[in-house]
């Protein structure tokens, strides 16, 4: 669709005569008829296939024609067409004399024709005017013409319809050839696809308007490149959604079980060495001079009763000193000047001669010790308490104060947390050093198998087109992470935008 425009500029008829040579009375009141038709090698009469137009009387004899386009007038003359411009044309321009006001062809005498020109040729669509001048024996006509496309029509022959728009059917303007030029932030054949925030993850992010980055399920962050870990994950990370990969020193489904109590809590005091011995369990190895479960108690060097044979111990700044009883000597009063004849063995101990009577040895009854059986046995010397129990040297019965989770005379027995059958729904109970663990049957989860869960939602391979399936344990559902080019809850639909009507 377009318009053939003809701009009449000047008509010269100096003698004021008709084509027949007869003069007009009083002068030639001149108007024009224009016929536009298909290309003819020899322009001949016949239908004006591309259109016709007539002017009012524009002047008498010789005159210039005013450009009236701005005022809504009729110059240039408009010959609209509703077809593809063929690139060639034939044009007939007739100048007529109007004796009266009726300009209809049937109202004019046949000899009212002043002049007739006919041209033909090629004409490309464009803004530039072609200037032409046609001269006959008595008249001269100067004019220019061009073909332009109607609004919203583009291309070499005005055949491409394009209407700029900025709504949900497209965001574009039209180029001179009729192709679409997307507005900033939009892409795709019809500029309907927003360009997401720069760096927005191709698979895990999307957008509904330019410079946006909305995350698909299981992803987070400004660019949707950070996975969301399992709901409740405490000390863990993920590389794909809903994972909970435990940080070093943590264990359990939610990485909330402390496997490195030493590092996380530093329980051992006074420079002691800490060793992890299970979940939330540890052992402190004390430096000399310290004792207690956490080596929190400072030892006196005399507390270890280093003086033998009834010697008494005195603490000194740089150690200790033993005051020996009569008949004994040495750093720890370990040497005797007595023999069995002196009845040196106390508390019912029996004496045995050694080195031909120069020395002796006492054989002590139970619960007594020392070279002369002078000491009651210190039950704590041999560290009899297992599993970090605290040894009690006093009292007739209980010898060890056990840490939580342990029992027995020497804290050698684990308290069985499994005895009360804490695992629900048929879960299997396992005793740990300090606690228990339940192994749950299919369909149940939680520390005590108390949570009913669906069996792995991904087990049925619900995702299509090689999409990655993730089980969202918090909602018992699956999430499909689609490869590029597919969409849908199961990635079952290919992305594409075929025009539904052919051009």
């Amino acid at each position: 669709s377009g318009v053939f425009q003809l701009q009449l500029q000047e008509f010269i008829n100096e003698r004021g005569v008709l084509a027949s040579g007869r003069p007009c009375e009083p002068g030639c009141r001149t108007f024009f008829r224009v016929c536009l038709k298909h290309f003819q090698a020899v322009v001949s009469p016949g239908p004006c296939t591309f259109g016709t137009v007539s002017t009012p009387v524009l002047g008498t004899n010789s005159f210039a024609v005013r450009d009236d386009s701005s005022g809504g007038g009729r110059n240039p003359l408009q010959l609209p067409f509703n077809f593809t411009w063929p690139g060639t044309f034939s044009l007939i321009i007739e100048a007529w004399h109007a004796p009266g006001d009726d300009l209809r062809p049937e109202a004019l005498p046949p000899d009212a024709l002043i002049s007739k020109i006919a041209i033909q040729g090629s004409l490309a669509v464009g803004q530039n005017w072609l200037l032409d001048e046609q001269t006959s024996t008595l008249t001269r006509l100067r004019y220019s013409y061009r073909v332009i496309c109607s609004d919203n029509y583009y291309g070499d022959n005005c055949s491409r319809l394009c209407k700029k728009r900025n709504d949900h059917f497209g965001h574009y303007v039209c180029q001179p050839d009729g192709n679409l030029s997307c507005l900033p932030g939009w892409t795709g054949e019809y500029c309907q696809q927003p360009i997401c925030l720069s760096g927005c993850h191709e698979q895990n992010g999307y957008c509904s308007k330019p410079a946006e980055c909305l995350c698909r399920p299981g992803w987070q962050g400004r660019l949707c490149n950070e996975c969301i870990p399992h709901n409740g994950c405490r000390h863990g990370t993920c590389s794909t959604p809903w994972q909970c990969t435990c940080d070093e020193g943590w264990g359990g489904l939610f990485c909330d079980q402390d496997l490195n109590y030493c590092t996380h809590h530093s329980p051992c005091k006074n420079g002691a060495t800490c060793s992890n011995s299970g979940q939330r369990s540890y052992t402190c190895t004390c430096r000399p001079g310290y004792t207690g479960v956490d080596c929190e108690l400072e030892l006196s060097e005399c507390d270890s009763n280093p003086c033998r044979n009834g010697g008494s111990c005195k603490d000194q700044e740089d150690g200790y000193h033993c005051l020996c009883p009569p008949g004994y000597y040495g750093l720890h009063c370990e040497h005797s000047t007595l023999s069995c004849a002196d009845s040196p063995c106390f508390n019912g101990g029996s004496c045995r001669e050694r080195n031909q009577g120069a020395n002796y040895a006492c054989e002590c009854p139970p619960n007594f010790t020392g070279s002369n059986c002078e000491k009651k046995v210190d039950r704590c010397t041999s560290n009899p308490c297992a599993n970090g129990g605290q040894c009690l040297n006093r009292g007739p019965s209980r010898m060890c104060r056990c840490r939580p989770g342990f029992t027995g005379t020497y804290c050698e027995l684990h308290v069985s947390d499994c005895a009360r059958n804490p695992c629900a729904h048929g879960g299997t109970c396992h005793d740990l050093e300090n606690g228990l663990m339940c192994t749950c049957p299919a369909g149940f989860s939680g520390r005590r198998c108390e949570v009913r869960t669906s069996i792995d939602a991904c087990a049925s391979s619900p995702c299509f087109n090689r999409a990655t399936c993730y089980t969202d344990l918090s909602t018992d559902t699956f999430v499909c992470n689609c490869p590029y080019g597919f969409v849908g809850s199961r990635c079952e639909f290919p992305v594409g935008l075929p025009p539904s009507f052919p051009w």
């Epitope: 709504d167 969409v487 935008l497």
Partner: antibody
């Protein structure tokens, strides 16, 4: 051949929410070539566009109804739905669902048969 | 808000040409669609993108759109063409329908 079928209650009380579902058969609602729209026609009156939705969930509403309208899509069921809240007698109409071309003119080439919803106590 | 204005009614004799106009500000810069609706039936798309006919629509239906006016032309009107006709265009992201024109075949 694509077919659209509206379903939902034919009678709604004033101030309540009108809910309709359109089930699409013979074609996928997840096609990138179409929007899916709702249009209504009060008895003896002309057509009024309510809004439309793309398979991704992007929605567009008539500004005069925007505060009361929600359109949603369920691609797994090949359905899209309309909710119109706080209805009055003026919302009594035949409600149509339709498929709109997603490019250029956006003409609606397939329509449901329509369902009459009366708002009355 | 954007409005599309149509004449309430147009009468035509069988075999003659019926022209229905639809006016709106700079409507020629938008794409116009036309729908035919017979009593008790759903609307049917007869013209889209100003002048294109969907498959199955007779050639006697044609459309044009320029300036402020879109026109639906029914050449050689038949009794079966008696119906209500609605024009439709998009203003930004909103669909807008004309008020409708009743075509009566005398």
């Amino acid at each position: 051949e694509v077919q659209l079928q509206e379903s939902g209650p034919g009678l709604v009380k004033p101030s309540e929410t009108l809910s309709l579902t359109c089930t699409v058969s013979g074609g996928s609602i997840s096609s990138s070539s179409y929007y899916w729209g709702w249009i209504r026609q009060p008895p003896g009156k002309g057509l009024e566009w309510i809004g439309d939705i793309y398979y991704t969930g992007s929605t567009y509403y008539n500004p005069s109804l925007k505060s009361r309208v929600t359109i949603s899509v369920d691609t797994s069921k090949n359905q899209f739905s309309l909710k119109l809240s706080s209805v009055t007698a003026a919302d009594t109409a035949v409600y149509y669902c339709a498929r709109e071309e997603a490019i250029l003119g956006g003409g609606s080439d397939y329509w449901g048969q329509g369902t009459l919803v009366t708002v009355s106590s | 808000s954007y409005e599309l204005t149509q004449p309430p009614s147009v009468s035509v004799s069988p075999g003659q040409t019926a022209s229905i106009t639809c006016s709106g500000q700079r409507l020629g810069d938008k794409y116009a669609s036309w729908y035919q609706q017979k009593p008790g039936q759903s609307p049917v798309l007869v013209i889209y993108e100003d002048s294109k006919r969907p498959s199955g629509i007779p050639e006697r239906f044609s459309g044009s759109n320029s300036g402020d006016t879109a026109t639906l032309t029914i050449s050689g009107t038949q009794p079966m063409d008696e119906a209500d006709y609605y024009c439709q265009a998009w203003d930004r992201d909103t669909g807008v329908f004309g008020y409708g024109t009743k075509v009566t075949v005398l």
